[in-house]
């Protein structure tokens, strides 16, 4: 099984114990590590952070002691913006320039492949996204002709039904991608006005349309029905939780909220807590399991957080094995307890390790 793990370059800027550099990663933990994100400037793939080249080196040095490890560079992301991707993909010359710029950039910096993180193609971009993938793959095949190992091509796709329908020609893009990471999280957010888990495995008992689509099981099944081969589908598992501020004394699933949760001590983003921050949040908190959805949530005062723990990730891995998927994807290594000091098990990356162990279990 594949264990595809994302690392985010901006995690270096978190203060104190939240700061994570690629040299803190475990070279034997994942089969693939994806560095997020690269930029595109003047239609050429480019660095994003001032020290990306140094960090690329740190990451790819991990392969010295584990030659089986594959590293990919992810291009795009939320801050890149869909419009910029759209302009490049829809213009033949821009697309060609971009595609041509990728292999030398990846080779120079020691990467084994490219991950496309166009978040998200619009309805009009659907065909252009397919073309971009098809042409990128063709370039990778051509570039490998002189006996080089062919560069890998993957894409991170939304798990939301509406986005899947408007953005992707699943059957076609699947032919050209080495694997597809389906982002089976962020199904529920503060915009709903109520508490809810952002990455449930199954549909909740109360879920009516459109909520019946907002779960991992539906998204995976839908992708398979649309023609994604199970052998290429990698299921996303988050090492972060989504939090809410409660608006009343109600604390269960579906309780009214006044907005996102308070920012974490290290991640400092309203509505999001890293797993390592959640381990601290749990001190003095009340933990519940949403039995049907097979995921936990915790409450403390006016804060509510839905997250994944070692039990829920094992359930998710068992599910993906039952469906004969290619493996699991983790967003993100730097949100797991990468130091091993927050969650009290004397174990670095406890969630990712739990996923790895479950994948290996017979």
């Amino acid at each position: 099984y594949k264990l595809v793990c994302y690392y985010t370059s901006w995690s270096q800027y978190r203060e104190g114990d939240g700061s994570c550099f690629p040299d803190a990663l475990d070279r034997f933990l994942c089969t693939h590590i994806i560095y997020s994100f690269a930029n595109i400037s003047n239609d050429h793939i480019d660095t994003w952070e001032w020290n990306d080249v140094t960090l690329y080196g740190m990451l790819n040095t991990l392969k010295n002691r584990n030659p089986n490890l594959k590293t990919l560079l992810s291009v795009g992301g939320w801050n890149f913006g869909s419009q910029r991707f759209s302009k490049i993909a829809s213009n033949t010359q821009s697309r060609r320039t971009f595609i041509k710029s990728v292999p030398p950039f990846l080779r120079t910096h020691g990467f084994d492949g490219l991950d496309l993180a166009w978040l998200y193609p619009g309805r009009r971009d659907k065909q252009h996204f397919t073309t971009l993938i098809k042409e990128m793959k063709a370039e990778f095949i051509k570039e490998a002709q002189p006996g080089k190992k062919q560069l890998l091509l993957s894409a991170a796709l939304s798990a939301g039904k509406v986005t899947i329908d408007s953005s992707y020609d699943i059957a076609k893009i699947s032919q050209h991608l080495d694997f597809i990471s389906i982002m089976t999280y962020d199904f529920h957010g503060a915009w709903r006005g109520t508490t809810g888990h952002h990455s449930p495995l199954f549909r909740g008992q109360e879920d009516a349309s459109p909520d019946r689509f907002s779960n991992t099981d539906y998204a995976v099944g839908y992708m398979l029905r649309l023609g994604a081969p199970a052998s290429k589908l990698v299921m996303g598992i988050p090492t972060f939780g989504r939090s809410f501020t409660l608006a009343s004394s109600e604390t269960g699933v579906g309780a009214p909220i006044s907005g996102p949760g308070i920012p974490g001590r290290f991640t400092k983003e309203a509505g999001t807590l890293a797993y390592y921050e959640i381990c601290d949040f749990l001190r003095g908190a009340t933990v519940h399991r949403i039995l049907g959805q097979q995921v936990p949530y915790a409450t403390k005062g006016n804060q509510w957080v839905g997250y994944d723990d070692q039990e829920s990730v094992k359930s998710k891995v068992q599910y993906l094995k039952d469906r004969q998927l290619a493996g699991a994807m983790v967003w993100a290594l730097d949100l797991d307890d990468f130091q091993g000091s927050f969650c009290g098990q004397d174990l670095r990356f406890p969630l990712t390790n739990a996923i790895k162990d479950a994948l290996a279990a017979t």
Epitope: I262, R283, K300, S341, F342, Q345
Partner: antibody, heavy 117, light 111 residues
């Protein structure tokens, strides 16, 4: 520069009430911080009185402190400790501290409370 | 309520020597590592030395070392300096934060 400063200490008569204020500068309580009040009687050790999780608003008290002491987040930069029914045994330097279990730990210089007639 | 017992007190050692202070908790601290060590000098607030049982706080010399897990913790000060003369406290955090408590303190005398 991040700082904590305690204020409100002074001389108070037995049975009296006092409110101590801890004021933060260089940061605010819009994130998760574990803010606590610690006291130290002259020549004695440190004693944890109360704490507040600024993220969730949950408050915690040492068993001996419950009832006479009240910790509150009164603004995005202030945490207070209200003390009632004071006795001579409450004479101490009162410290405000942030995150004692993290590298982000910070202490104020302390404020002296003297309970005497 | 859980208790933290520090031993010995006082303790004295020569400059360049090593001092070991133990902190025994009556029940396991949260996540087995919610234990901090502080140094306090007269007229000053405490200063964090070690947190999460073994992590050295920023700016603290590596002569200070924390170890232990669960209920038994140790602070070791090696290559003792005159400036290390102070009282040292452990602080334990528990699953119920209302149970958090300091140890009684250990005075270190440098000869």
């Amino acid at each position: 520069q991040e700082q904590l400063v305690e204020s409100g200490g002074g001389l108070v008569t037995p049975g009296g009430t006092l409110t101590l204020t801890c004021t933060a500068s260089g940061f605010d309580f819009s994130s998760y911080y574990y803010m606590c009040w610690v006291r130290q009687a002259p020549g004695k050790g440190l004693e944890l009185i109360a704490a507040i999780d600024t993220g969730s608003g949950e408050t915690y008290y040492a068993s001996w402190a419950n009832g006479r002491f009240t910790i509150s987040k009164t603004s995005s930069t202030t945490v207070t400790l209200q003390m009632t029914s004071l006795t001579a045994a409450d004479t101490a330097t009162y410290f405000c501290a942030r995150d004692p279990y993290f590298g982000t730990n910070l202490w104020g210089p302390g404020t002296l409370v003297t309970v005497s007639s | 309520d859980p208790m933290l017992t520090q031993t010995p007190s006082p303790v004295s050692a020569a400059v360049g020597g090593t001092v070991t202070i133990t902190c025994q908790a009556s029940q396991s601290v949260y996540n087995n590592n919610y234990l901090s060590w502080f140094q306090q000098k007269p007229g000053q607030p405490p200063k964090l030395l070690i947190y999460k049982a073994s992590i050295l706080a920023s700016g603290v010399p590596s002569r200070f070392k924390g170890s232990g897990s669960g209920t038994q913790f140790t602070l070791t000060i090696s290559d003792l300096q005159c400036d290390d003369a102070a009282t040292y406290y452990c602080l334990g955090g528990y699953s119920s934060p209302s149970d958090d408590a300091f140890g009684g303190g250990t005075k270190v005398v440098v000869e």
